[in-house]
Interface confidence: low
């Protein structure tokens, strides 16, 4: 339904509080370097304007599109050229090119200081002094660091953030109450951001068809009792929601996500038996709950897939009449029968099926040609099964930290050109697959592990895209979305890599390492490990282990010393010399 004023429509739909929060998120995701106060001022101006349009939809400029209104507002920022350089050129363009230009300048790794958590009492005072500003600041800081964060979900995080402070700032032991909650929100937030980044990459780099295929597979696993038509409707609506959010249309996205949650809850009888609890919650919790809901039970006595997709004489006729619908039905039927497969595996199987039909439906005897298509699936299924089995065994043997180290070495040897911080971040996240997924029974391991790895490898891809340094990474990232993980798994040691010059400064440590948290200390050690491999890519596991053990002992010794700094200086020189000797540098 057409509205005279889009801004008034969204303001009325969402209410002032959500409207302001979403505009703040949108602006912070576009102008990631702007100070908080500047963004708040812009948001207030937009909100006041929206209110005039609510009062009179025919008022001046109220008929303009949201992109025009928001873009015009962003382009009023005085320091745009000094702060953002060529992004300022976007302002010379007209919509829709201007918005596309802003989108292209979103930075997945903005040069922003690390968020340092103040003392609990300081945070509680700030929360009580001005709750509204405190929560806005949270939205702003998260949004500017995660420019693709799923905006309606960020409202849910903010609601939990507020609840944590409301509860814990009144508790006897504020820190004991608050810190675990903040840690949980931080970890969940990073995971949520990474998952959404994959959805946006899928839409932006591989198109709507790729995203819809992913959605058909995932929703069919989750709602196996729903009919194909129902799943297709949900996929269409979900695609619209994510297209809007990934495109910066956050008000439309939040509104449409809310409507989708409403539709799902009104039609839960024909969708899933697992939705009842979700649908009793308020909206933000409801939408989150639906997105995370467990798979419904598979209907009993589902017929064999072969009848419709292999044995039927009408396969090529059905395929020719509506290719995407027929492939969608194949994916739906396969996915609802296989909650034990990863989504990316299901998509590989669908791709293999499509390739086979393309070839066979042009052959002299199509049925004879595609009769054995399901046999081609066997190696595709076994490859991730075996890989997960091997890596879970390794994880159980080593524990998370050492498993991460094994992956650090593995990936540094595969793509040594990638920056050390990126290799550390990605390998640490890859290593978390162990504690996240290996505890699951066989039937849940693959969907957990391989779909998680897709999210992590996408982080590598988006970070690498900003400053490309490796043709091999570019190739694995761009050739096929569903084959990224097999592509990286198949990479061997890069024989063309010229080892990095040895730099003693890289291996010089100071007493500040002693006051770091266990996690930060691990990152320091893992950074050193990556640098070692870059200096000596052919180093054996044993050599690297010996050096890392020496390094751990060195840190432990100097952190216990009375004069820590002197210890780090003197013992550090000995360690570097010993390491060079051990590695033959």
């Amino acid at each position: 339904d057409a509205h005279k004023s889009e801004v008034a429509h969204r303001f009325k739909d969402l209410g002032e509080e959500n409207f302001k929060a979403l505009v703040l998120i949108a602006f912070a995701q576009y102008l990631q370097q702007c100070p908080f106060e500047d963004h708040v001022k812009l948001v207030n101006e937009v909100t006041e304007f929206a209110k005039t349009c609510v009062a009179d939809e025919s008022a001046e400029n109220c008929d303009k599109s949201l992109h025009t209104l928001f873009g015009d507002k962003l382009c009023t920022v005085a320091t745009l050229r000094e702060t953002y350089g060529e992004m300022a050129d976007c302002c010379a363009k007209q919509e829709p090119e201007r918005n596309e230009c802003f989108l292209q300048h979103k930075d997945d790794n903005p040069n922003l200081p690390r968020l340092v958590r103040p003392e609990v009492d300081v945070m509680c005072t700030a929360f009580h002094d001005n709750e509204e500003t405190f929560l806005k600041k949270y939205l702003y800081e998260i949004a500017r660091r995660h420019p693709y964060f799923y905006a309606p979900e960020l409202l849910f995080f903010a609601k939990r953030y507020k609840a944590a402070f409301t509860e814990c700032c009144q508790a006897a032991d504020k820190a004991a109450c608050l810190l675990p909650k903040l840690d949980e929100l931080r970890d969940e937030g990073k995971a949520s951001s990474a998952k959404q980044r994959l959805k946006c990459a899928s839409l932006q780099k591989f198109g709507e068809r790729a995203f819809k295929a992913w959605a058909v597979a995932r929703l069919s696993q989750r709602f196996p009792k729903a009919e194909f038509a129902e799943v297709s409707k949900l996929v269409t609506d979900l695609t619209k929601v994510h297209t809007e959010c990934c495109h910066g249309d956050l008000l439309e996205c939040a509104d449409d996500r809310a409507d989708l949650a409403k539709y799902i809850c009104e039609n839960q009888d024909s969708i899933s038996s697992k939705l009842k609890e979700c649908c009793e919650k308020p909206l933000l919790e409801k939408s989150h709950c639906i997105a995370e809901v467990e798979n419904d039970e598979m209907p009993a006595d589902l017929p064999s897939l072969a009848a419709d997709f292999v044995e039927s004489k009408d396969v090529c006729k059905n395929y020719a009449e509506a290719k995407d619908v027929f492939l969608g039905m194949f994916l739906y039927e396969y996915a609802r029968r296989h909650p034990d497969y990863s989504v990316v595996l299901l998509l590989r199987l669908a791709k293999t099926y499509e390739t086979t039909l393309e070839k066979c439906c042009a052959a002299a005897d199509p049925h004879e040609c595609y009769a054995k298509v399901f046999d081609e699936f066997k190696p595709l299924v076994e490859e991730p099964q075996n890989l997960i089995k091997q890596n879970c065994e390794l994880f159980e043997q080593l524990g998370e930290y050492k498993f991460q180290n094994a992956l650090l070495v593995r990936y540094t040897k595969k793509v040594p050109q990638v920056s050390t911080p990126t290799l550390v971040e990605v390998s640490r996240n890859l290593g978390k697959v162990g504690s996240k997924c290996c505890k699951h029974p066989e039937a849940k391991r693959m969907p957990c592990a391989e779909d998680y790895l897709s999210v992590v490898l996408n982080q590598l891809c988006v970070l690498h895209e900003k400053t490309p340094v490796s043709d091999r990474v570019t190739k694995c990232c761009t050739e096929s979305l569903v084959n990224r993980r097999p592509c990286f798994s198949a990479l061997e040691v890069d024989e063309t890599y010229v080892p990095k010059e040895f730099n003693a400064e890289t291996f010089t440590f100071h007493a500040d390492i002693c006051t770091l948290s266990e996690k930060e200390r691990q990152i320091k050690k893992q950074t050193a490990l990556v640098e070692l491999v870059k200096h000596k890519p052919k180093a054996t596991k044993e050599q690297l282990k010996a050096v890392m053990d020496d390094f751990a002992a060195f840190v432990e010794k100097c952190c216990k010393a009375d004069d820590k700094e002197t210890c780090f200086a003197e013992e550090g020189k000995k360690l570097v010399a010993a390491s060079q000797a051990a590695l033959g540098l």
């Epitope: 009325k12 509104d255 919650k281 308020p282 909206l283």
Partner: antibody, heavy 120, light 110 residues
Framework: EVQLVESGGGLVQPGGSLRLSCAVS????????MTWVRQAPGKCLEWIGT?????NTNYANWAKGRFTISKDSTTVYLQMNSLRAEDTAVYYC????????????????WGQGTLVTVSS | DIVMTQSPSTLSASVGDRVTITCQAS??????LAWYQQKPGKAPKLLIY???TVASGVPSRFKGSGSGTEFTLTISSLQPDDFATYYC????????????FGCGTKVEIK
């Protein structure tokens, strides 16, 4: 300004009919469920019925048959037939939370009420 | 049908007191419960929904808790403006009696 204004109340004889109106402004009935609630003098609040965004209605068991809720683009109506003395009350219309941004269940906005007196 | 029982029906308290009102549902309603405040001659005003979510513009001294069949409204420090009647209300969109109100608790000056 977001508001609800009831009208149509007054004195009616037992067995008579009355149609109450609730004019809404500042929001759209296509986005919010609307509910009628009544309160007899000095008594509890009593739910009468609800009309959803799509126009479906749901009534309290005691109200079925005698009370009918309907709506057009900006007004919600309560048609009351075969009125009795015990129907004497202040009648409120109330808005549920936004169908999407909060469940259409808690009643987030109320009109000022209109008094209906059933007496001979 | 769901029946909501509120207690006490009347409560005498002074400014600054901590006040607790309870509401019991005849069957489990999960967290589908709201609390309202009503002053003489006025329409009810929403305070809490979904058992514990504070409605917009409501002071933080109002707190809702509970789930299933037992619910509580607490006013941490009673203010002069808080003397009124408080109602609980269940909502269940799967049931024919979508809404059921308690009969109210009148908070009066001691």
């Amino acid at each position: 300004e977001v508001q609800l204004v009831e009208s149509g109340g007054g004195l009616v004889q037992p067995g008579g009919s009355l149609r109450l109106s609730c004019a809404v402004s500042g929001f759209s009935l296509s986005r919010y469920a609307m509910t009628w609630v009544r309160q007899a003098p000095g008594k509890c609040l009593e739910w009468i019925g609800t009309i959803t965004t799509g126009g479906n209605t749901n009534y309290a068991n005691w109200a079925k048959g005698r009370f009918t809720i309907s709506k057009d683009s900006t007004t919600v109506y309560l048609q009351m037939n075969s009125l009795r003395a015990e129907d004497t009350a202040v009648y409120y219309c109330a808005r549920g939370g936004y169908v999407s941004y909060a469940d259409a269940t808690e009643l987030s906005l109320w009109g000022q009420g209109t008094l209906v007196t059933v007496s001979s | 049908d769901i029946v909501m029982t509120q207690s006490p029906s009347t409560l005498s308290a002074s400014v600054g007191d901590r006040v607790t009102i309870t509401c019991q549902a005849s069957q489990s309603i999960g967290s589908r419960l709201a609390w309202y405040q009503q002053k003489p001659g006025k329409a009810p005003k929403l305070l809490i929904y979904y058992a514990s979510t504070v409605a917009s513009g409501v002071p933080s001294r109002f707190k809702g808790s509970g789930s299933g069949t037992e619910f509580t409204l607490t006013i941490s420090s009673l203010q002069p403006d808080d003397f009124a009647t408080y109602y609980c209300q269940s909502y269940d969109y799967s049931s024919s009696s979508s809404y059921a109100f308690g009969c109210g608790t009148k908070v009066e000056i001691k």
